[in-house]
């Protein structure tokens, strides 16, 4: 059962796992949610009746019954983790805590103009977990405007104390706001020989990389595969760090794989969700329950629905016994990973999918697409929406992309002459325009947010957000697309598609069925040569065939240029402008979304 509200002046008795320090009960709840075992917590707020050394303590708790006895205690705030909830969860914490000093290892001290600048510095520093900034009113002259970057083993402060004229806050890496590089590569036959901060068991290098990503101290990892010569180290995932933030030594070793934390890419690839099944593999751990199940998929479902289950092993039924049902072993451990991994016993193992809701919805795999042909099939581009105007009559106006459950990203030029958001209607999950009838449900538009530097499509800043009146329930036919990570600026996308209901030639009409075209990206230098009369800026991205023939056209505006990278679709461009349609040596020009990620997040995450 999902309980989101906090219980004031209430303490949960017993069940303690560990104590951390958090600046608020709200953040204590987030920490509890991300902890592998925590189901409940008790936070102690600052209060004259409470011992100051206990202020800001966040006690993480577990219980076999998923609840604990409640005791009245002033200044105590208790609650439940969001593990029990189905809604999307984020560790992003933009709050600034006034007059609080969050203690940790102060590894960097520098002057900053503001707390915001200090927070940005922390966000763009690979080691930084949180910061404290002494304001210009701070009593000690030599400490004024000093920005202290801090880290700890747990990612949370070792203590929090009251201190006048300072402010503290957390790194915004988990808000997708870091400019740090996103290195997705896994290097085969490589060992990073730096200090280990922790080690866990993992079935493959991908799971190891994802564990590294959500471990607060891990910057890179080495994984020993099941063919690793030293038996005791097989399936061992070593979580590592270094002072420089990069591996100091790479050793060539067969059957080992190494890679980097995906912290700077976590909004565009799954880091919590281990959805694969591991055949002929047994995960060992503390047994929670043994249940009969028809298949390993059914076993995974049982594990996902059992809030304390972290991983499972399924042993298929022998011949026709037990109505063809096998045994499903639901398991857990102190860190969420198996204590040992065994091979060759015939089991099928995997992880709970409960943690998938901690990943961005946009990373969910969509159904395989049909290659070739220009007409799309249902569910092929689930982020694509058709934006209709009702003026003078109802009709398709522009395309757009779902990027959040209340947000559509589109082009600013679509709103020329649109005097009110009320006249707009957003339809999602649509393949054919003819499906849209008078009684077809739609999303009303609450607000149109046009980039304030937009003047005309050709001069850039052709980007707009639509805030919907109601939220989108994600399904197979309507779900978000990932924004590109800022750390992905240097990625070369090779699988890019433009989609829309627009014209198929310059003098045409809106198409009934959603059209798709695979189009190669063109360098900005090349694009500039084709548009000598225009300035192709780094905030634009071009795509098209030299010989023409495939392009976006009238009516496609605002729609996505979607590129697949590492099995995840990214919104690389927004259809903006071009000379004619599909003309030779006239590529289409798109808004370069990665350059507007900060703007998008600022507008969509505004309180």
């Amino acid at each position: 059962e999902c309980v989101t509200q906090l219980l004031k002046d209430t303490c949960f008795e017993g069940g303690d796992i560990t104590t951390v320090f958090t600046p608020s009960a709200k953040y204590c709840q987030v920490v509890c949610t991300y902890h592998p075992r925590c189901l409940l917590f008790t936070f102690t707020a600052e209060s004259p009746s409470e011992d100051p050394t206990r202020w800001f303590t966040c006690v993480l708790k577990d219980s076999v019954t998923e609840t604990l006895p409640r005791v009245n205690r002033t200044a105590a705030i208790s609650g439940y983790s969001f593990k029990q909830c189905s809604h999307q969860i984020s560790a992003c914490n933009k709050d600034i805590y006034v007059d609080l000093d969050m203690k940790g290892i102060n590894y960097n001290s520098s002057v900053a103009k503001s707390a915001q600048e200090c927070q940005e510095r922390c966000t763009d520093d690979v080691h930084c977990h949180f910061f404290t900034y002494a304001t210009r009113q701070f009593p000690s002259l030599e400490h004024r405007n000093i920005c202290l970057l801090k880290h700890t083993q747990t990612g949370t402060p070792t203590r929090i104390t009251k201190l006048d004229k300072v402010v503290s806050g957390f790194s915004l890496k988990s808000c997708a706001l870091s400019n740090l590089a996103c290195i997705r590569d896994i290097f085969p036959n490589t060992v990073f020989a730096d200090s280990n901060i922790d080690s866990v068991m993992a079935p493959d290098a991908f799971v190891c990389g994802r564990i590294c990503t959500h471990h607060p101290g891990c910057l890179f990892f080495t994984f020993f595969s099941q063919e690793w010569p030293k038996e005791s180290q097989r399936n061992l995932c070593l979580l590592k760090t270094s002072e420089s933030g990069l591996p100091s030594t790479r050793i060539k070793k067969s059957k080992a794989l190494s890679g980097f934390s995906l912290q700077s890419c976590r909004h565009s690839i799954p880091v919590f969700c281990h959805s694969s099944f591991y055949h002929d593999t047994d995960f060992l751990g503390e047994e929670l329950d043994i249940v009969a199940a028809k298949s390993h998929e059914a076993c995974q479902k049982l594990c996902t629905n059992a809030v304390r289950c972290q991983f499972f092993t399924y042993t298929p039924a022998q011949a026709s016994c037990n109505e063809g049902k096998g045994k499903c072993y639901l398991k857990l451990s102190s860190n969420g990973s198996p204590t040992k991994i065994l091979h060759g016993r015939g089991g099928i193992s995997g992880y709970t999918l409960r943690l998938c809701k901690m990943d961005n919805e946009c990373t969910t795999k969509i159904k395989p697409r049909i290659v070739g042909g220009t007409a799309s099939v249902r569910g092929e581009w689930p982020w694509q929406v058709t934006l209709h105007t009702t003026s003078p009559t109802q009709r398709h106006l522009c395309g757009g992309s779902i990027i959040g459950n209340q947000w559509i990203l589109t082009a600013a030029h679509c709103f020329y002459g649109v005097e009110s958001p009320k006249i707009l209607r957003v339809y999602s999950g649509i393949l054919n325009q003819s499906e849209i009838k008078e009684d077809t449900s739609f999303f009303g538009v609450q607000e149109i947010i046009i980039h304030d530097q937009y003047k005309m499509a050709e001069s850039g800043y052709d980007i707009a957000l639509l805030k919907l009146e109601t939220t989108v329930n994600y399904t197979d036919s309507q779900r978000p697309i990932c924004l590109p990570s800022k750390g992905d600026r240097n990625v070369i996308y090779t699988d890019c598609w433009v989609t829309g209901w627009g014209y198929r030639k310059l003098r045409d009409k809106i198409q009934n069925t959603l059209q798709k075209a695979k189009i190669p990206l063109v360098t900005n230098e090349e694009c500039q040569k084709r548009y000598r009369g225009h300035k192709i800026t780094h905030k634009m991205i071009c795509a098209g065939y030299r010989e023409g023939g495939k392009d976006a056209c009238k009516g496609d505006s605002g729609g996505p240029l979607s590129c697949k990278h590492n099995e995840v679709w990214h919104l690389v461009g927004i259809t903006s402008w071009g000379e004619g349609c599909a003309q030779r040596e006239r590529p289409g020009v798109y808004t370069n979304v990665v350059e507007y990620v900060d703007w998008i997040l600022e507008k969509t995450q505004a309180v």
């Epitope: 009702t390 003026s391 003078p392 009559t393 109802q394 009709r395 005097e419 009110s420 958001p421 009320k422 006249i423 009838k437 008078e438 003098r507 009409k509 809106i510």
Partner: antibody, heavy 117, light 107 residues
Framework: QVQLVQSGSELKKPGASVKLSCKAS????????MHWVKQAHGQGLEWIGN????????NYDEKFRTRATLTADTSTSTAYMHLSSLTSEDSAVYYC??????????WGQGTSVTVSS | NIVMTQSPSSLSASVGDRVTITCKAS??????VSWFQQKPGQAPKLLIY???NRYTGVPDRFSGSGSATDFTLTISSLQAEDVADYHC?????????FGQGTKLEIK
């Protein structure tokens, strides 16, 4: 069922103003544009303008922009057209019509306005 | 402004005849054209929308065709009750405009 009921006939002197009403029922008034159309005796249809009740967005034909004012009262689901500085040229039947999903699908019965000294 | 030129302005035909009324737009209006029927002393009624779609309850002897600039309303077999004025109108762009109307009579 959708119904648009217009106010009764009007007889006005040149230079005067008139305010016509159109009461809507049977649908969500705020979600559809309401248009006003003029038809002089024995003539064709002439578009005056439209209003979106949910936002009070309006559009007018240039010819009527200075003299016609369209308003809507969402509490009573009623659209109004105010026409000022009347001349004999304004003598006509005025229709309110709802812009449905595809076209002007429902029309009021019309209000006859006569401008005469 | 888009001008809608309707022809003929009047026509007389016998019951059972095939009747065609045309409407020409001064510029491309895609398929944003409607046809209305107006009987004496009544308000106009929608017959055809989107150039070729018959509105609910309209007899199937009425049909519309065309796109871009040339549009046609056809009555496949004229009935006595079809005596009326017929108007075309475009809703592609503001200001909305109508044809001058066609008066249809029975011979």
């Amino acid at each position: 069922q959708v119904q648009l009921v217009q106010s009764g006939s009007e007889l006005k002197k040149p230079g005067a103003s008139v305010k016509l009403s159109c009461k809507a029922s049977g649908y969500t008034f705020t979600r559809y544009w309401m248009h006003w159309v003029k038809q002089a005796h024995g003539q064709g249809l002439e578009w005056i303008g439209n209003i979106y009740p949910d936002s009070d967005s309006t559009n007018y034909d240039e010819k009527f922009r200075t003299r016609a004012t369209l308003t809507a009262d969402t509490s009573t689901s009623t659209a109004y057209m105010h026409l000022s500085s009347l001349t004999s040229e304004d003598s006509a039947v005025y229709y309110c019509t709802r812009m449905g999903f595809y076209a002007m699908d429902y029309w009021g019965q019309g209000t006859s306005v006569t401008v005469s000294s | 402004n888009i001008v809608m030129t309707q022809s003929p302005s009047s026509l007389s035909a016998s019951v059972g005849d095939r009747v065609t009324i045309t409407c020409k737009a001064s510029e491309n209006v895609v398929t944003y054209v409607s046809w209305f029927q107006q009987k004496p002393g009544q308000a106009p009624k929608l017959l055809i929308y989107g150039a070729s779609n018959r509105y609910t309850g309209v007899p199937d002897r009425f049909s519309g065709s065309g796109s871009a600039t040339d549009f046609t309303l056809t009555i496949s077999s004229l009935q006595a009750e079809d005596v009326a004025d017929y108007h075309c109108g475009q809703s592609y762009s503001y200001p909305l405009t109508f044809g001058q109307g066609t008066k249809l009579e029975i011979k």
